[in-house]
């Protein structure tokens, strides 16, 4: 029960985190015009990963995309890449984790497979969260560095060189959304990894002992005493219980390290 709860909660937390990473990546307010100690301008500038915007006091807002790829700073490209990698990994992790959820039954998927899938999705969430945190932190560092370089004729926007007194930029809302979302995805991933340990069946060196009686092929299972005869209509081998113990024929056909008494 605790394992299911941990896995479910990890999934939900990761889902919220990845939604946040997507939102942060799409947001325009990665950096916003610093209004402190500045003359009061009637325009407000803010920039995202994909475009820069200007909001006039009248309410008119104009956004321009960064249509150049080569003309953009390498750091911005790196941040874009980190965020996209984070989203892709997170999305794949979500897809994997849906099938790994203990509360969802898909065919005859074994717990061992679910455990492996839970671990895989957990690792993907952790890497996704780290990518988002790294991307946001790199951008924040870039802002802090540029903040003090408020000399005229310096590179001021994401789009190129302009002959003007530099507008100083500070942290935008997207940075905080990204940090929180990355953290949530990371926590969700850790929870999935913890849940994986509970899902994986315990390993043991014991095998089910088979006693062959003349006439009937009977597999004695301690704790189960459910036998399958070799005659009559009951010719198919039946599972004794879900814990991994199998009838003799099954064990012979499909050996598994998870068989235990």
């Amino acid at each position: 029960m605790a394992v299911t709860a941990c896995q479910g909660l990890g999934f939900v937390v990761s889902l919220i985190g990845i939604a946040g990473i997507i939102a942060a990546t799409c947001m325009d307010q990665w950096s916003t015009q610093d209004l402190y100690n500045n003359p009061v301008t009637a325009v407000f500038n803010y920039q995202g990963l994909w475009r820069s915007c200007v909001r006039e006091s009248s309410g008119f807002t104009e956004c321009r995309g960064y249509f150049t790829l080569l003309g953009l700073p390498a750091m911005l490209q790196a941040v874009r890449a980190l965020m996209i990698v984070g989203i892709v990994l997170g999305a794949i992790g979500l897809l994997v984790s849906i099938f790994a959820l203990k509360c969802i039954r898909i065919g005859s998927m074994e717990d061992s497979a679910k455990a492996n899938m839970t671990l895989t999705s957990g690792i993907m969430f952790i890497v996704s969260g780290l990518c988002a945190i790294a991307g946001v932190s790199v951008f924040a560092n870039m802002l802090v560095t540029n903040f003090w370089m408020s000399t005229a004729n310096m590179y001021t926007g994401m789009g190129g060189m302009v002959q003007t007194v530099q507008t100083r930029y500070t942290f935008g809302a997207a940075l905080f959304v990204g940090w929180v979302a990355g953290g949530l995805t990371l926590i969700g991933g850790v929870m999935m990894c913890i849940a994986c340990r509970g899902l994986a069946p315990e390993e043991t060196n014991y095998k089910a002992v088979s006693y062959h009686a003349s006439g009937h092929s009977v597999a004695y299972k301690p704790g189960g005493f459910k036998a399958s005869t070799g005659f009559g209509s009951n010719t198919k081998n039946k599972k004794i219980y879900d814990g991994g113990a199998r009838t003799e024929d099954e064990v012979q056909s499909y050996p598994s390290k998870h068989d235990y008494v």
Epitope: V40, T41, A42, N45, E56, S57, S58, G59, V165, T167
Partner: antibody, heavy 118, light 113 residues
Framework: QVQLKESGPGLVAPSQSLSITCTVS????????VSWVRQPPGKGLEWLGV???????IYHSALKSRLSISRDNSKRQVFLKVNSLQIDDTATYYC????????????WGQGTSVIVSS | DIMMTQSPSSLTVTTGEKVTLTCKSS????????????LTWYQQKPGHPPKLLIY???TRESGVPVRFTGSGSGTDFTLTISSVQAEDLTVYYC?????????FGSGTKLEMR
């Protein structure tokens, strides 16, 4: 069509307060800003302040302590109040609609003449 | 506050002549975010309120004759009338609309020679 009309007292005694009303039509006060500009006789234009569509008000720094701009959206009216009037506050007072682009004042009222005299 | 300096204060012209009015600001009116200059030009005839001619330093307001052209960037701006007509002989003002307060220039008066 867009129209703005100022109405004021005409003559005001020094140290008194001046209240001017700008009644607008053809546009919404919650969508567009309204600026106040004055022009002393034979002189240039002086920007006094603005009330933006979102209700935010900005005043000329030199007159900030004496100015107040407010509005009544339902009555479609914008109000300018100037306290502690002096002789050099004598001017024609205009209200003007702020355009959507570039903070340009695209429509103006005809203005109301205010004389500060004892 | 930003100081707006217009020159000359008055200018004597003849109809059909090309006229250039200048306006200088004490600070740059260029916004780096959209590379637009926040400067407007107005025309005011005697006994009338000002009329908007140009915004964003070079964008002509609808209904304004094409003979009026705004140009310039940063701190130096010009209003050019390619062929002055009799009705153009009046006062022209430039205005900073970038940094509060929105200060006006002192004006340039066009007079008939």
């Amino acid at each position: 069509q867009v129209q703005l009309k100022e109405s004021g007292p005409g003559l005001v005694a020094p140290s008194q307060s001046l209240s001017i009303t700008c009644t607008v039509s053809g546009f919404s006060l919650t969508s567009y800003g309204v600026s106040w500009v004055r022009q002393p006789p034979g002189k240039g234009l002086e920007w006094l302040g603005v009330i933006w569509g979102d209700g935010n008000t900005i005043y000329h720094s030199a007159l900030k302590s004496r100015l107040s701009i407010s509005r009544d959206n339902s009555k479609r009216q914008v109000f300018l109040k100037v306290n502690s009037l002096q002789i050099d506050d004598t001017a024609t007072y205009y209200c003007a609609k702020q355009g959507l682009y570039g903070h340009a004042m695209d429509y103006w009222g005809q203005g109301t003449s205010v004389i500060v005299s004892s | 506050d930003i100081m707006m300096t217009q020159s000359p204060s008055s200018l004597t012209v003849t109809t059909g002549e090309k006229v250039t009015l200048t306006c200088k600001s004490s600070q740059s009116l260029l916004n780096s975010g959209n590379l637009k200059n926040y400067l407007t030009w107005y025309q005011q005839k005697p006994g009338h309120p000002p009329k908007l001619l140009i915004y964003w330093a070079s964008t002509r307001e609808s209904g304004v004759p094409v003979r009026f052209t705004g140009s310039g960037s940063g701190t130096d701006f010009t209003l050019t009338i390619s062929s002055v007509q009799a009705e153009d002989l009046t006062v022209y003002y430039c205005q900073n609309v970038y940094i509060y307060p929105f200060t006006f220039g002192s004006g340039t008066k066009l007079e008939m020679r």
